[in-house]
C-alpha cells in the first residue's frame, strides 16, 4: 500500500553557485519511526544488482551515527515528521536530483527533489500591475525564488539608480508550499515617472550587488497644460481685450480634444489652443481654464483669474440673524458688486447715518429692543460710489417682562374656597401664547392667564405662574395663605410611660398638626361631660372609675376637630371580693354545693387559693368551688383569695350549714 | 535474527532442471519480499527474480524469463525458484534474500534496494 508514505516539500529549490539551499520537508511514514536515512545525488536504479547507483551525499546509520566528514549537507529532520535538509555550501554540480532514501521498521521509500543551481546569482523578477495610472497606489512587487538561513539576502528598489523612499515590506518563505523572497512597494507614481526605469537589485548581506531585474514605468496620465494670459496680470477695464493660450507639455496616451472652461462651465465654440475675448464686460469677469483630454480622462490647466473692474452696484444688507434674541450677537453684512473690492461703507439705522461705521460688516456684540429697525448700506471704490439699496429689517425678540401673579379673591382664604389668579406682564416679542402655573394640579383655566382653584386646600401655600412665547418668564410666587381648623387631632398619654396602675399620677395632651390661625382653645370630655379647657388633663391619683372613653377637641376662628375617642384602662388589684353559694349556705348532706371567688379586678384574676375555717389552704385553685356529694362535716366558714399581674385580694368569711339527711336522722 | 537456509543445488547437465527451496525463519514482518540472487566467480551480485508475500507479485531477471519460476509457500515461510532448461551461463552460487518492501515515490520495487538478510548460499553447476 503505497499511500504508507506522505511527503511535502516543494518541487524544485533554487540557488547559486557558492549560495546555500534549505529543503523544508514533513513527512509520515505510518508504521513507524525512521530508522536509516540516506539522501543520494542523481539516484539511478540499477535492476540487475537491486540497488541505486549514484553519489550519497548523506548517511545515518540505523545505529545512529553519521560520518564525520558530512559538514556541507545537513539532514535537520527527527524520526517521524520532519525531513528538512541544509546544503551549505551549493554548488554547480549539485543541480538535478536529490533522492531521500528512507527506512521505516517495515518498508523502505525513495522521495525526488529537483534541485536547480546556476553559475551566477539569477535575477529577481519584477511583477507590475497591468495598467499603471498617476496618483492611484500601486503595489511593486520583487520575486526572487530563494531564501536560506545560512545564506542572508536583500532586495532594493531604484528609481533611476536611486534608492526609492517608500518602505519596502520584504518577506520571506521557507515552507513545504514554497520557497522565495518576495520585496513589495507600495508606490503612487506620478505623471513625471513615466518612462522612468525602476530596478530591483538583489544584493547580499553586507549591500554586494548580485544580480537585478528592471523595467520601465508607463504611467498613463491625463494631458499636463500650461495657461498663458495677455496682458499677464489679468486685470482689465470693461472694453479691453484679452487673450488666453493653452500649451500641452505632456500626455499619455495622445490628447484628443481641447475646451476653454469659465467658473467650472464649458464655453461654445471655442475648441482650439487660443482664445479671444474682444470688449469685455463685467459678467465675463471670473476663473479661466483650458482643459484637453486623452483616453485616460481630462486635463486642466491652472485657473486665470480674470478681473474686469467697475463701480459698486446697489448694496443690500444681510443680517446674521434675524428675528434675534435679546442679549445675543448679531452681525450686519454690506453686500455690492464691485472690482476692485469696496474701500469705504456708510451704515444707516431706520434712515439715520451711524456715525463711525465704516466697514463692510457692522458688529453689535448685545442686542436690545431698541436695536429693531431697518438697516440699509452705501459702499464706494476708486471706481465711484454705488446706492442705497431697500435694506433690512432687524426684529429683537425677548420673553415677557414683569411678569407678576395677581390674587382675585378678597382676603383671607379659607380651605374649601374657591381662588381665582391671574398672570400678568408688561410686555413681549414674540406675543404670550400660553401661561405655565406651579405647583401643577387639577386646576381650571377658565381663560388664557386665568387659573381657578376650586375647594382650595389648607396645603395650598404658594403659586407661581409663567408668560411664555418662545420662552417663559417666571413670576415671584405668592402666598395664597389659607386659614383652616386645626388638623390631625389626636389623644396622647405623656405620663405614666407604662401601664397605668390605680393610685398612679396620669396625664393626657391634646396634640394637633397643625391650625391657621394659630389661636385655639381645648375642650376636654369623658361620656358627653365636659371635664376641662387646658391642652392637658390630669389625675393626681387614678381610680379605677375613672377608667373610660375620653376625647379631646381643638377649635379657632374657622372651626373646631375633634380627636378619636381614647380608651383609659386603670389596672388594679382584685377587690371587692366574696364567696357566693349555691344552691344557697345551707345544704342537706349528699347533695352538691358550689362555692363561686367573686371579685373586681383588671387585669381579670389569673389565680384563685381557697381557704377553710382553720385559714387551711386547699387544693383548688379555680373561681369555683364544687363540694359533692357534700358532708356533714364540710360544715364551716370558707373564704378565698384572687390574684392578678397587679397584686392580692381577700373575701370575707362565709358560712355553709350541711345538715344530715331524713335517712341519716331515720338511721339514728 | 532472521536465518534464511537454501538447498536443491547441485551439479546437471545443459537442458537439466533443478528446484531451490529456500526456508526463512525469525522474520516477524507480514508484508515482505523474497528474491534470489545469484555470483558467478569474478561477477558481481545479481538479480534472478523476486515475489512479493501478500500479493505474489513476480519479477524475473531477462535473462531467465520463460524458463524459472519463483513461487511461494506463506505457511511455511518458503520461497522455491523451479530451474528449466538450465544453460552453463545459470552455473553460480544461488543466495535467496529477504526484506521489506521498497516504494521509490508512488512506485513500487518488487525486487527491493539493499536486500538486508542473506542466506549462505547453495551451488548449481551446468556442465556437460
Known amino acids: 500500500d503505497s499511500s504508507k508514505w506522505v511527503f511535502e516539500h516543494p518541487e524544485t529549490l533554487y540557488a547559486w553557485e557558492g549560495a546555500c539551499v534549505w529543503i523544508p520537508c514533513t513527512y509520515r511514514a505510518l508504521d513507524g519511526d525512521l530508522e536509516s536515512f540516506i539522501l543520494f545525488h542523481n539516484p539511478e536504479y540499477n535492476k540487475n544488482t537491486s540497488k541505486f547507483d549514484g553519489t550519497r551525499l548523506y548517511e545515518s546509520t540505523k545505529d545512529g551515527k553519521v560520518p564525520s566528514e558530512q559538514k556541507r549537507v545537513q539532514f535537520l529532520g527527527d524520526k517521524n515528521k520532519n525531513c528538512t535538509l541544509s546544503i551549505h555550501p551549493v554548488h554547480l554540480n549539485d543541480s538535478g536530483q536529490l533522492g531521500l532514501r528512507m527506512e521505516s521498521k517495515t518498508e523502505k521509500w525513495m522521495e525526488r527533489i529537483h534541485l536547480n543551481v546556476s553559475e551566477r546569482p539569477f535575477p529577481p523578477h519584477i511583477q507590475l500591475p497591468p495598467e499603471i495610472q498617476e496618483s492611484q497606489e500601486v503595489t511593486l512587487t520583487c520575486l526572487l525564488n530563494f531564501s536560506c538561513y545560512g545564506y542572508p539576502i536583500q532586495l532594493q528598489w531604484l528609481l533611476e539608480g536611486v534608492p526609492m523612499r517608500q518602505a519596502a515590506v520584504t518577506s520571506t518563505s521557507l515552507t513545504i508550499k514554497s520557497v522565495f523572497t518576495r520585496s513589495e512597494l507600495k508606490f503612487s507614481p506620478q505623471w513625471s515617472h513615466h518612462g522612468k526605469i525602476v530596478t530591483c537589485q538583489l544584493q547580499d548581506a553586507d549591500g554586494k550587488f548580485l544580480s537585478n531585474d528592471t523595467v520601465q514605468l508607463n504611467v498613463k496620465h491625463t494631458p499636463k497644460l500650461e495657461i498663458k494670459v495677455t496682458p499677464s496680470d489679468a486685470i482689465v477695464r470693461e472694453g479691453d481685450s484679452v487673450t488666453m493660450t493653452c500649451e500641452v507639455s505632456s500626455s499619455n496616451p495622445e490628447y484628443t480634444t481641447v475646451s476653454w472652461l469659465k467658473d467650472g462651465t464649458s464655453l461654445k465654440k471655442q475648441n482650439t489652443f487660443t482664445l479671444n475675448l474682444r470688449e469685455v464686460t463685467k459678467d465675463q469677469s471670473g476663473k479661466y481654464c483650458c482643459q484637453v483630454s486623452n483616453d485616460v480622462g481630462p486635463g486642466r490647466s491652472e485657473e486665470v483669474f480674470l478681473q474686469v473692474q467697475y463701480a459698486p452696484e446697489p448694496s443690500t444688507v444681510q443680517i446674521l440673524h434675524s428675528p434675534a434674541v435679546e442679549g445675543s450677537q448679531v452681525e450686519f453684512l454690506c453686500m455690492s458688486l464691485a472690482n476692485p473690492l469696496p474701500t469705504n461703507y456708510t451704515w444707516y439705522h431706520n434712515g439715520k447715518e451711524m456715525q463711525g461705521r465704516t466697514e463692510e460688516k457692522v458688529h453689535i456684540p448685545k442686542i436690545l429692543p431698541w436695536h429693531a429697525g431697518t438697516y440699509s448700506c452705501v459702499a464706494e471704490n476708486i471706481l465711484g460710489t454705488g446706492q442705497r439699496g431697500p435694506g433690512a429689517e432687524l426684529d429683537v425678540q425677548y420673553p415677557p417682562k414683569k411678569v407678576t401673579t395677581v390674587i382675585q379673591n378678597p382676603m383671607p382664604i379659607r380651605e374649601g374656597d374657591t381662588v381665582t389668579l391671574s398672570c400678568n406682564y408688561n410686555s413681549s416679542n414674540p406675543s404670550v401664547t400660553r401661561y405655565e402655573w406651579k405647583p401643577h394640579g387639577a386646576w381650571e383655566e377658565p381663560s388664557l392667564g386665568v387659573l381657578k382653584i376650586q375647594n382650595v386646600g389648607w396645603d395650598n401655600t404658594t403659586i407661581a405662574c409663567a408668560a411664555c412665547n418662545s420662552w417663559c418668564s417666571w413670576a415671584s410666587p405668592v402666598a395664597l395663605n389659607v386659614q383652616y381648623a386645626p388638623r390631625d387631632v389626636r389623644v396622647r398619654k405623656i405620663k405614666p410611660l407604662s401601664e397605668i396602675h390605680s393610685g398612679n399620677s396620669v396625664s393626657l395632651q391634646c396634640d394637633f398638626s397643625s391650625s391657621h390661625p394659630k389661636e385655639v382653645q381645648f375642650f376636654w370630655e369623658k361620656n358627653g361631660r365636659l371635664l376641662g379647657k387646658e391642652s392637658q388633663l390630669n389625675f393626681d391619683s387614678i381610680s379605677p372609675e375613672d377608667a373610660g372613653s375620653y376625647s379631646c377637641w381643638v377649635n379657632n376662628s374657622i372651626g373646631q376637630t375633634a380627636s378619636k375617642a381614647w380608651t383609659l384602662e386603670v389596672l388594679y388589684a382584685p377587690r371587692r371580693l366574696r364567696v357566693s353559694m349555691s344552691p344557697g349556705d345551707q345544704v342537706m348532706e349528699g347533695k352538691s354545693a358550689t362555692l363561686t371567688c367573686e371579685s373586681d379586678a383588671n387585669p381579670p384574676v389569673s389565680h384563685y387559693t381557697w381557704f377553710d375555717w382553720n385559714n387551711q389552704s386547699l387544693p383548688y385553685h379555680s373561681q369555683k368551688l364544687r363540694l359533692e356529694p357534700v358532708k356533714v362535716q364540710h360544715s364551716g366558714a370558707y373564704w378565698c383569695q384572687g390574684t392578678n399581674s397587679v397584686g392580692k385580694g381577700r373575701s370575707p368569711l362565709s358560712t355553709l350549714t350541711v345538715y344530715y339527711s331524713p335517712e341519716t336522722i331515720g338511721r339514728r | 535474527q532472521v536465518q534464511l537456509v537454501e538447498s536443491g543445488g547441485g551439479v546437471v547437465r545443459p537442458g537439466d532442471s533443478l528446484r531451490l527451496s529456500c526456508t526463512v525463519s525469525g522474520f516477524t514482518l507480514d508484508y515482505y519480499v523474497m528474491g534470489w540472487f545469484r555470483q558467478a566467480p569474478g561477477k558481481e551480485r545479481e538479480v534472478v527474480s523476486c515475489?512479493?508475500?501478500?500479493?505474489?507479485?513476480?519479477y524475473y531477471a531477462d535473462s531467465v524469463k520463460g524458463r524459472f519460476t519463483i513461487s511461494r509457500d506463506n505457511a511455511k515461510n518458503t520461497v522455491y525458484l523451479q530451474m528449466n532448461s538450465l544453460k552453463p551461463e545459470d552455473t553460480a552460487i544461488y543466495y535467496c534474500?529477504?526484506?521489506?518492501?521498497?516504494?521509490?515515490?508512488?512506485?513500487?520495487?518488487?525486487?527491493?534496494?539493499?536486500?538486508?538478510?542473506w542466506g549462505q548460499g547453495t551451488q548449481v553447476t551446468v556442465s556437460s
Open positions: 515475489i512479493s508475500s501478500s500479493d505474489g507479485v513476480t
Open positions: 534474500a529477504v526484506d521489506k518492501p521498497f516504494y521509490d515515490g508512488g512506485y513500487y520495487y518488487t525486487c527491493p534496494v539493499d536486500f538486508d538478510s
